[in-house]
Amino acid sequence: LMGGQDKPFLSARPSTVVPRGGHVALQCHYRRGFNNFMLYKEDRSHVPIFHGRIFQESFIMGPVTPAHAGTYRCRGSRPHSLTGWSAPSNPLVIMVTGNHRKPSLLAHPGPLLKSGETVILQCWSDVMFEHFFLHREGISEDPSRLVGQIHDGVSKANFSIGPLMPVLAGTYRCYGSVPHSPYQLSAPSDPLDIVITGLYEKPSLSAQPGPTVQAGENVTLSCSSWSSYDIYHLSREGEAHERRLRAVPKVNRTFQADFPLGPATHGGTYRCFGSFRALPCVWSNSSDPLLVSVTGNPSSSWPSPTEPSSKSGICRHLH
């Protein structure tokens, strides 16, 4: 990862993708340490702040403007050389977001996938973006970039992710850029959580008072396992939203979560999954499906006292 013998390594924390008004720390790593360094911007725009200035260990840039977007290099201090400075570092591209309307991001076949499968993340917009960028939250590497394809007044790009492994699970966002301003990106798409299942043993799912209930009777679904899952996720076939609850250790040494569904109005097929706090987007195998049937007066909906989570937020910790 580090540069060659006389070449420093320039990196950005937390990410090279920075929202307008945000801050980013640029680090110039040279000869096994962070020493004094100078910064350069390749297109020479917006650099009065760098002229003749020497930075120590890191440079905090911000609040950033579109003019900060571009390619940066650093030179490390080398007192005994002719120039006093190293060769230029690797180029580091800083992308500034929030400059155009956000695109949309969709997952095909869906955001809940088995380990080893491939998912297509499609980023699209009615803004004629030349390039689309896909970025996973918490990753400092550059985002993936694709040329936008334009059809019927819509520009789009299909990012293929896979075969899926735990390291690829997480929250994705995409951005677009217009011609002539390749590093001035749009606002981020709404976040999309990619969840990988099938990594751990399946929990068991049961219904109280039972899987067949009278209309209006209160139903609770219990998800439990001997594995010390931190969180359980309950999904209902045909519903986009999952519900989640913290697992509670029980006296019989199992870990359980009880999902109150409220008064029964109509049935459905339910599954639950377990996950650990450290990897909130990596889930267990699915429990066996549980068919809940309602006898009596069927209705078109089942009220939910536990608020379903939004389409994103699965990969955030439950506090």
């Epitope: 937390p14 801050h23 009065p48 905090i60 003019a67």
Partner: antibody, heavy 118, light 107 residues
């Protein structure tokens, strides 16, 4: 939302020390720095210096070198300004403000009044 | 150190007036100028940086312009809530320095 919350007012005797805290929330503390600004009675704003919250490296304005010291506790997202050997002319409101190497101070604490009087 | 000379030090305007505050730097500061608003009993608030970039949530009646050594903050239609002291600041080289402030009052 981004917030900087400073410690309360202090009344000190000449020669004593004071430590002002500034607790940050709503952003990743180590991706920005903390600037410190003094506003003396009847005077304008004067920059004391700043500390890079990523590297921990402080930088002081010439007039504030010696008795003024910055520190950080990144585990609690807090920056500190310590003033030692207090003098009557240190009586002022001290502000912390988020900012980096570019010197723009985009969010400010509410200010801490330090009064030095015998 | 770069000296920022701000004028006027005080101005009185009617609601709806266009208000202009100027700041002159003792040397070229390459558009690295910020403007702050400080209302009574409150900390300063960033309005503008890099001469003309409005900070998040700042109404578009506030605008900035300038280059070299001369910079201007304009309030296109002053409102009662704009009563405050306004400061310019150069962020070109350390020590960062502020202007002496302009107190804006509503008639």
């Amino acid at each position: 939302q981004i917030q900087l919350v400073q410690s309360g007012s202090e009344l000190k005797k000449p020669g004593a020390s004071v430590k002002v805290s500034c607790k940050a929330s709503g952003y990743t503390f180590t991706t920005a720095g903390m600037q410190w600004v003094q506003k003396s009675p009847g005077q304008g704003l004067e920059w004391i210096g700043w500390i890079n919250s990523h590297s921990g490296v402080p930088k002081y304005a010439e007039d504030f070198k010696g008795r003024f010291a910055f520190s950080l506790d990144t585990s609690v997202s807090t920056a500190y300004l310590q003033i030692s050997s207090l003098k009557a002319e240190d009586t002022a409101v001290y502000f912390c403000a988020r900012g980096g190497d570019e010197g723009v101070m985009d969010y400010w604490g509410q200010g801490t009044t330090v009064t030095v009087s015998s | 150190d770069i000296v920022m000379t701000q004028s006027p030090s005080f101005l009185s305007a009617s609601v709806g007036d266009r208000v202009t505050i100027t700041c002159k730097a003792s040397q070229d500061v390459s558009t690295a100028v910020a403007w702050y608003q400080q209302k009574p009993g409150q900390p300063p608030k960033l309005l503008i940086y890099w001469t003309s970039t409005r900070h998040t949530g700042v109404p578009d009646r506030f605008s900035g312009s300038g280059s070299g050594t001369d910079y201007t903050l304009t309030i296109s239609s002053v409102q009662a809530e704009d009563v405050a002291v306004y400061y310019c600041q150069q962020h070109y080289s350390t020590p960062w320095t502020f202007g002496g402030g302009t107190k804006v009052e509503i008639k």
